[in-house]
């Protein structure tokens, strides 16, 4: 095959080699870019910057080598469009630093930086950590900082990510209230900060205020849906990123729903309870307190992480006619009470039949509607007791 006269020549089925001295000053318009998995660049003194736009369209790229060239700066978002990159060799260039953001989100198996005039600073603390933890083949390179000695010996006591403190109201928050959150950011070299509010949806009207080092967030006209939702403050500096999440507890009265008994392996009277704080529960059977035992007890399903409602069953093991009757679930928290009742018939009474009738042996649950009581004002004389903690 005739030698390739171009700046960049195909290499294998999906590779490209660019090795002709000084032929490139950027990576725009590389031939066949969208299918490239390997890109090898050498001896390109004019290639000094690597930026987001340079690698746009290289979505399949897995191996990138830029060696013995003039690379002085790699943008923090340079590899945003190459999420599959696993090997990155930037050795023997003019790099003094490389941001932690550059490699964030990549699963690099190999990162080669030897032969660069690295400048030891907190901005390379992440690389020092890679060396300590044996990541990316970094330890084997014995990286040196230009005129400062080994990277491994760089003092790092003051190299910390930002420290965040989020102040939340300690007073009770009610539905309809406005809530002010404040995020205090401390640390050296602060670059950016903000709020992540993706979980909030319709839980409140959001207004942001202030900037570094003190960010404000007003959640106006909050709803009970705000409970269990994360409000996250984040901040970045040259060392890394810190996040702190808080949740705002919005008080609302207890509510309860009961459903028709169903036969699973054992019988289950399904229920749902809601409220903040989590209500205490109590069962009545035919108007009397039902004490839980291993044969009749409350069992909760695994709670969803982002909601206050709890679902569960009153479990009954092999109930007979003596268990037929009216089941009431009482729920109470400091903001209100609610109750719901349901009739359940698990088995006909074998002692109540006409001698001429066949003896009934089948299980036959009665299909009755549940009555879900609205939250009511708490009255002292209501016979509530602490039985079941829902939270």
């Amino acid at each position: 095959a005739a030698p390739c006269p171009d700046a960049c020549c195909p290499h294998g089925s999906s590779g490209l080699r660019c090795t002709r001295d000084g032929a490139l000053d950027s990576l725009h318009h590389l031939p066949g870019a969208e299918n490239l998995t390997e890109l090898y660049i050498e001896n390109q003194q004019h290639l000094q910057h690597l930026e987001l736009r340079d690698l746009r369209g290289l979505g399949e790229l897995r191996n990138l080598t830029i060696v013995k060239s003039g690379l002085r700066f790699v943008a923090p978002d340079a590899f945003h469009f190459t999420p599959r990159l696993s090997r990155l060799n930037l050795s023997f260039n003019a790099l003094e630093s490389l941001s932690w953001k550059t490699v964030q989100g990549l699963s690099l198996q190999e990162l080669v930086l030897s032969g660069n005039p690295l400048h030891c600073s907190c901005a390379l603390r992440w690389l020092q950590r890679w060396e300590e933890e044996g990541l990316g083949g970094v330890p084997e390179q014995k990286l040196q900082c230009h005129g400062q000695g080994p990277l491994a010996h760089m003092p790092n006591a003051s190299c910390g990510v930002p420290t965040l403190k989020v102040q939340v109201p300690n007073a009770s928050v009610d539905v309809g209230d406005d809530v002010l959150l404040r995020c205090q950011v401390e640390g050296r070299g602060l670059e950016q900060a903000g709020w992540i509010l993706t979980e909030l949806e319709q839980s409140a009207t959001v207004m942001k205020s202030g900037g570094l080092p003190s960010l404000g967030l007003t959640l106006a006209n909050v709803t009970s849906d705000l409970n269990r939702k994360n409000v996250t403050c984040w901040a970045e500096n040259d060392v890394g990123r810190a996040e702190v999440s808080v949740q705002v507890n919005v008080s609302f009265p207890a509510s309860v729903q009961l459903h028709t008994a169903v036969e699973m392996h054992h019988w289950c009277i399904p229920f749902s309870v809601d409220g903040q704080p989590a209500p205490s529960l109590r069962w009545l059977f035919n108007g009397s307190v039902l004490n839980e035992t291993s044969f009749i007890f409350t069992e909760f399903l695994e709670p969803a992480a982002n909601e206050t409602v709890r679902h569960g069953c009153l479990r009954l093991n092999q109930p007979t006619h003596v268990n037929n009757g009216n089941y009431t679930l009482l729920a109470a928290n400091p903001f209100g009470q609610a109750s719901a009742s349901i009739m359940a018939a698990f088995m006909d009474n074998p002692f109540e039949f006409n001698p001429e009738d066949p003896i009934p042996v089948s299980f036959s649950p009665v299909d009755t509607n549940s009555t879900s009581g609205d939250p009511v004002e708490k009255k002292d004389e209501t016979p509530f007791g602490v039985s079941v903690a829902v939270g």
């Epitope: 035992t293 291993s294 044969f295 007890f297 069992e299 093991n317 092999q318 007979t320």
Partner: antibody, heavy 117, light 109 residues
Amino acid sequence: QVQLQQSGAELMKPGASVKISCKAIGYTFSRYWIEWVKQRPGHGLEWIGEILPGRGVTNYNENFKGKATFTVDISSTTTYIQFSSLTSEDSAVYYCARSNYGDYDFWGQGTSLTVSS
Amino acid sequence: QTVVTQESALTTSPGETVTLTCRSSSGAVTTSNHANWVQEKPDHLFTSLMGGTNNRAPGVPARFSGSLIGDKAALTITGAQTEDEAIYFCALWYSNHWVFGGGTKLTVL
């Protein structure tokens, strides 16, 4: 597989307190009741009570209220029974057993308690 | 206080069928009593055999079966084996507590 491992034999003085443990292995500890049973020669088996580890709900035999107290450590999947004001009547072998919706299915190996001055 | 009564001792031969019973002083035993049967072998080795009157516990051989016979709970061993020699306890549930029987010493000669 499911196992209940009980603590070793105890020799106690009258008036003292003692705590016996029952470590659960091989199943979701919080979801099954643990039963406690007393065995004395010539007295057969006596049910002390039960506890649901996940929620700490307890149910005691009237005869043991004030004598026995159940506790749970979820992190170590261990249930405890504590006896107070020990007398010679408390000398016995104590068993924990798992209850599967009421029915016994697995038993511990027993812990012997001797109360003697 | 309810008393639960069992035969104090029974003797059977290998291959024979033997039935152990469990009576309640407070009336007929019903499914509401959730009769449980437990086997004790030497060195305090307890094994659950039967729950809920007739539900065999995990790993229990099919020769063991539970039932209600008349006003009593019963454990039947169909084709007894020498390793079945043990003490058998029944337990009955009364709304919120268990009461154990005194145990039946089964000898398989």
